[in-house]
């Protein structure tokens, strides 16, 4: 004889005074059985669209519409996509740190400037947060070279650039 709500499955609710497992009404869910109420399903509207529809056992999941990205736990808000020279972080769009760039609009991460010296070439044009360095032709002279160590903002890590 079932006299308790403990045996109720997800997707149902149950009241102690009338311990019968009842299905969650439409637009509600319960991921744990035996609760006195089902939860109201999340609605994805405005800047949000449905990533996963609500079921009797799981809440809906939202994602952001094109041109926006999620912020916060369970995508609680949408923020405009990042511009070139930025990358997405949990805090939102952040300017690329020194020695890195992102030339993409809306996506991608900041990546290091090309190390021209790897190919024996000089730096023709220095890099920016939006553009990579431009390497010149191969170096033929044997003049002494200087290495500049660029440290990314906020932490250690050297990115060597060869300046001739």
């Amino acid at each position: 004889v079932q006299n308790s709500c403990d045996n109720c499955q997800p997707g149902t609710f149950c009241r102690k005074y009338n311990p019968v497992c009842k299905s969650c009404p439409p637009s509600t869910f319960s991921s744990i059985g035996g609760q006195p109420n089902c939860n109201i399903c999340r609605v994805c509207a405005g800047y949000f669209r449905f990533k996963k529809f609500c079921s009797s056992t799981h809440n809906a999941e939202c994602e952001c519409i094109e041109g926006f990205h999620c912020l916060g736990p369970q995508c609680t808000r949408c923020e405009k996509d990042c511009r070139p020279g930025q990358e997405l972080t949990k805090q939102g769009c952040k300017t690329c740190s020194l020695g890195t760039f992102n030339d993409q609009n809306g996506t991608g991460v900041c990546r290091p400037w090309t190390n021209c010296s790897l190919d024996g070439r000089s730096v023709l044009k220095t890099g920016t947060t939006e553009k990579d360095v431009v390497c010149g032709p191969p170096v033929v002279s044997f003049s002494p070279s200087t290495t500049i160590s660029v440290t990314p903002e906020g932490g250690p890590g050297g990115h060597s650039l060869q300046v001739l």
Partner: antibody
Framework: EVQLVQSGAEVKKPGSSVKVSCKAS????????IYWVRQAPGQGLEWIGN????????FYGEKFMGRATFTADTSTSTAYMELSSLRSEDTAVYYC??????????????WGQGTLVTVSS | SVELTQPPSVSVSPGQTARITCKLN????????VHWYQQKPGQAPVTMIY?????PDGIPERFSGSSDSSSNSAFLTISGVQAEDEADYYC??????????FGGGTKLTVL
């Protein structure tokens, strides 16, 4: 299927160098950072540095600057980590790992199986 | 610089709930993504939780991630712990978007 396959275990003498490889498959090698992380016996995870294989740009942890060198061969989709002037404290399992390009502070979604480097005289 | 502090060990009986803490020493936990890896002896780390609370495909629902701004900590919660969950667990975040930082690891023992 994304895979990172590392080279086999190495035993090295103090003062020598070791070069560990990490062969990537199942994705566009030039579009994701490869990070190098090590783990000494019974210890935690320690960042060595990372490389963007698309242009060979590198970052090194302060502790490893001047001693670690990362390279990438895009023709074989292989990343390399060379560590010079080895000492006994460098005995560790060395891992390569891929970081997705979703955000700048993202997780490592795929790891190599690890390469044990033993430094002993 | 950012440091993540974890308890060296956590013990729990099978079927109970384990909660592993990862405390941020400076800044605000809400400003940093925290990721969690499981590592068993002789194996590479495996992602259990990424971007605070997301579970990769194939990771059981028993594993969940959360954070609390008042204690400036992130949490990995394992409900209904099983013997196979015995492993080392590491939290991971960033000092800058280049520099990853790992917690010291927590050994989970299933009694």
């Amino acid at each position: 299927e994304v895979q990172l396959v590392q080279s086999g275990a190495e035993v090295k003498k103090p003062g020598s160098s070791v070069k560990v490889s990490c062969k990537a498959s199942g994705y566009t090698f030039t579009s994701y950072y490869i990070y190098w992380v090590r783990q000494a016996p019974g210890q935690g995870l320690e960042w060595i540095g990372n490389i963007w294989p698309g242009n060979g740009g590198t970052f090194y942890g302060e502790k490893f600057m001047g001693r670690a060198t990362f390279t990438a061969d895009t023709s074989t989709s292989t990343a390399y980590m060379e560590l010079s002037s080895l000492r006994s404290e460098d005995t560790a399992v060395y891992y390569c790992a891929r970081r997705p390009d979703y955000s700048g502070d993202d997780y490592f979604d795929y790891w190599g199986q690890g390469t044990l480097v033993t430094v002993s005289s | 610089s950012v440091e993540l502090t974890q308890p060296p060990s956590v013990s729990v009986s099978p079927g109970q709930t384990a909660r592993i803490t990862c405390k941020l020493n400076s800044g605000n936990i809400g400003s940093y993504y925290v990721h969690w890896y499981q590592q068993k002896p002789g194996q590479a780390p495996v992602t259990m939780i990424y971007r605070d609370d997301k579970r990769p495909d194939g990771i059981p629902e028993r594993f969940s991630g959360s954070s609390d701004s008042s204690s400036n900590s992130a949490f990995l919660t394992i409900s209904g712990v099983q013997a196979e969950d015995e492993a080392d667990y590491y939290c991971h975040s960033y000092d800058s978007t280049i520099t990853p930082v790992f917690g010291g690891g927590t050994k989970l023992t299933v009694l």
